[in-house]
Amino acid sequence: RVTTNPVDLWSAPSSQARLEKEYFDQHFGPFFRTEQLIIRAPLTDKHIYQPYPSGADVPFGPPLDIQILHQVLDLQIAIENITASYDNETVTLQDICLAPLSPYNTNCTILSVLNYFQNSHSVLDHKKGDDFFVYADYHTHFLYCVRAPASLNDTSLLHDPCLGTFGGPVFPWLVLGGYDDQNYNNATALVITFPVNNYYNDTEKLQRAQAWEKEFINFVKNYKNPNLTISFTAERSIEDELNRESDSDVF
């Protein structure tokens, strides 16, 4: 028998840590599963945003280019639409995701900078401007939201909300990488996290989630966009690697 569960491999069944984890999982449910992408834009330069009516020029990192954000949103929406099959049933992200306000709001939690724009291309493109000046656009909205992620109104001419579609705030340190201090506009990477429900002693539900994760991995592995460099991981990734290693060891 090949053991591939990291918990079984790296903690003794009677250890204090294992006992406490068992207690927690049994009483509160296990910590959710995470599917995560880290995205960079290697072919894009940083750019400068000049606020109107005044203020210092603000540099924006390569992945915060409007075209890159649209492409990342396309990718994110495509991932949301991934379907898997388990036991002759279709499994979607909606079936397994963490939706904290369900049933009133069934939207999945997606920790992504795009959720400042409610995962919408049209909100991302929302702009107040004319031939001469841009008074408010995605730059303005981003700069406001990283300071007040739970806001329902960015106080610019756009009056757009920052709150994610799942009903919660998206903290900038969870969705951006490579910035200095709290200058989130200097980010060199975007991080997108899909938290998925985890299950204690419910093998079927667990396997449904794993089936979706498998399709997620296949999709991202085969995703081609020269403007984006994508690193990714799924909750099952460690187990998959252990499986691969174990199989080769057996042979």
Partner: antibody, heavy 117, light 107 residues
């Protein structure tokens, strides 16, 4: 409070050049906004002429581009309009104004220019 | 250039009346329209921006509406001090242009 004040000649002869000054108090013209010239003809029609942005960039109304110039003196917090080869058609009240992100929110009181020989 | 047409040069009204001043753009200007009030002997004063947002300090009897090509400034209950010229202006496309103005007269 932000205040704008136009100054310049009351009378200019046809074919001469016109120079107007807008003195801004209460806000630095290099700190923000864009600073514009607008004129109002007898009969009340308004025409936007040009602007200078706080960064120094400039834009002109294409209908005036060949004979108009806008400059500034940051040390005096002033900006200037020069209009060449004036004709009687340039007789108007000339206003300087600040463009907020919402409209012309501050105006000078205007200076009336007559072009006549 | 975009032409802003204010079809009524003059409008006569009584104190307490509701009056609507219209402005038509020769092409789509989205909501990039501003309304100004100019009282005799004074400079124009900003009333409404982005077609429908009241500028700070403007009484709430003034409301703006419209988008695309048709815009309206409404005074819900005219006061004697509202006697003035009213202009619309588009800033959607260069050059920025103004309407010819509508003079509001009190009967």
């Amino acid at each position: 409070d932000v205040q704008l004040q136009e100054s310049g000649p009351d009378l200019v002869k046809p074919s001469q050049s016109l120079s107007l000054t807008c003195t801004v108090t209460g806000y630095s013209i290099t700190s923000g906004y864009s600073w514009h010239w607008i004129r109002q003809f007898p009969g009340n029609r308004l025409e936007w002429m040009d602007y200078i942005h706080y960064s120094g960039s400039i834009n002109y109304n294409p209908s005036l581009k060949s004979r108009i110039s806008i400059t500034r003196d940051t040390s005096k917090n002033q900006f200037f309009l020069q209009l060449n080869s004036v004709t009687t058609e340039d007789t108007a009240t000339y206003y300087c104004a600040r463009w907020g992100a919402t409209g012309f929110d501050y105006w000078g009181q205007g200076t009336t220019l007559t072009v006549s020989s | 250039d975009i032409v802003m047409t204010q079809s009524h040069k003059f409008m006569s009204t009584s104190v307490g009346d509701r009056v609507s001043i219209t402005c038509k753009a020769s092409q789509d200007v989205n909501t990039a329209v501003v309304w100004y009030q100019q009282k005799p002997g004074q400079s124009p004063k900003l009333l409404i921006y982005w077609a429908s947002t009241r500028h700070t300090g403007v009484p709430d009897r003034f409301t703006g509406s419209g988008s695309g090509t048709d815009f309206t400034l409404t005074i819900s209950s005219v006061q004697a001090e509202d006697l003035a010229l009213y202009y619309c202006q588009q800033h959607y496309t260069s050059p920025w242009t103004f309407g010819g103005g509508t003079k509001l007269e009190i009967k």
